[in-house]
């Protein structure tokens, strides 16, 4: 808190310029009018105010706008944004994507901070949904952004926004998140032809049901093992050996290296050993020949 002292003669600021950098904290407080500061915020970003002076400038803006800063001020905060607390940011109403970009730029190259998370939350809530332009912007600055959202939050993502998602944006998503995103991706890419469709949908397949995997197996997609290992176990289990062979194409040989890991391990346990032997990979652990398999879950569903 800066003491209230009178501005020395001749030091009253007429405009926000570089000469203010040499003002002491108390001089800055006494000689810079908060309204002048607010109208000339575009200059503040261009002037390398000292660490202590930024505190004074924030204090002046807080006094002028106790209910929260207007967007005309927010978009020019620059480094001053890094002096804000999440509580400060919760008072803001940010509607312009340009403002959001300007503030994300200040924090670029660093992990998402509580301030940035609050800013994004305010922005998205204000828009009502996570539209394509916003998603484009957020994933450009924070590739992991999408996977930081809850399944409930992801449900507000319109299918059209899925076009903005890059494979690396989904790296840290868990199956619950992919369950929400996959149907949106399927809808978004539905008019693409087979090979193009697979390239786009591949990153989302961790949320695909069995019937979609069966359909893909008929399209010569040659799914790689990394993608296969991320599929839902419950979606993989009902696939036949022939279907998995068609799904993986030349990559089927990779099953041997993964035979102890889910979902491959669990899938092997569900296949007849005879069928597994047709792959010629030496996969072991299938159902021995002559054994009868009862699908109890099917029986329960019928009763």
């Amino acid at each position: 808190e800066v003491e209230k002292t009178a501005c020395p003669s001749g030091k009253k600021a007429r405009e926000i310029d570089e000469s203010l950098i040499f003002y002491k904290k108390w001089e800055l407080e006494a000689c810079v009018d908060a309204a002048l500061l607010a109208t000339q915020m575009d200059r503040v970003n261009a002037i390398p105010f000292t660490y202590e002076q930024l505190d004074v400038l924030k204090h002046k803006l807080d006094e002028l706008y106790p209910q929260g800063y207007p967007e005309s001020v927010i978009q020019h905060l620059g480094y001053l944004f890094l002096k804000m607390s999440p509580e400060d940011i919760r008072k803001w109403n940010v509607t312009s994507l340009e403002t959001l970009k300007a503030l994300l730029e200040v924090n670029k190259g660093h992990e998402m901070s509580p301030q940035v998370a609050t800013l994004i939350d305010r922005f998205v809530k204000g828009r009502g949904q996570l539209d394509k332009d916003t998603l484009d912007t957020l994933t450009a600055f924070y590739p992991g952004y999408l996977c930081s959202l809850s399944p409930e939050e992801l449900s507000s993502v319109p299918p059209s926004s899925i076009w903005a998602v890059r494979p690396q944006d989904l790296d840290t998503c868990d199956p619950r998140q992919l369950d929400v995103l996959y149907p949106k991706a399927r809808l978004a890419f539905q008019n693409m032809n087979g090979s193009e469709y697979f390239v786009k949908i591949q990153s989302f397949l961790g949320g695909a049901p069995t019937e979609d995997l069966k359909a893909l197996s008929q399209q010569n997609v040659s799914m790689d093992l990394a993608t296969f290992m991320k599929l839902r176990t419950d979606a993989v289990l009902p696939l036949t050996v022939a279907e998995v062979q068609k799904l993986l194409g030349p990559h089927v040989e990779g099953l041997k290296a993964e035979e102890r890991h889910r979902p491959v391990r669990d899938w092997i346990l569900r296949q007849r050993q005879d069928d597994l032997d047709t792959l010629g990979l030496g996969l072991q652990g299938g159902i021995p020949n002559g054994y009868l398999v009862l699908d109890l879950s099917m029986q329960e569903a019928l009763s």
């Epitope: 660490y51 480094y79 901070s113």
Partner: nanobody
Framework: EVQLVESGGGLVQAGGSLRLSCAAS????????MYWYRQAPGKERELVAF???????NVRDSVKGRFTISRDNSKNTLYLQMNSLRAEDTAVYYC?????????????WGQGTLVTVSS
Amino acid sequence: EVQLVESGGGLVQAGGSLRLSCAASGSTSSINTMYWYRQAPGKERELVAFISSGGSTNVRDSVKGRFTISRDNSKNTLYLQMNSLRAEDTAVYYCNTYIPYGGTLHDFWGQGTLVTVSS
């Protein structure tokens, strides 16, 4: 984290020259503007000069024409060339910068180097 170490201070006669250096280490890629401050005995600390990452500089009126600030980014070093020194320039000179990290700004200071100008 940024570490700042000043050197180059000492005793000099009025009218003489000194060149102060400030070696920066640590997260130097995040450094934008760098500052020289000074604190004379019994007085509050004041800003002497600054230089932005783009190279634009400014010095306070009382040292204009006598002091020059510069930096060598390849050596991560900040300089203050002080000519025509006066008794009133006697002070501890500090180098300072701040960087964004973890969503906030972090302020870093050197330990200071003493400049004594004898008349």
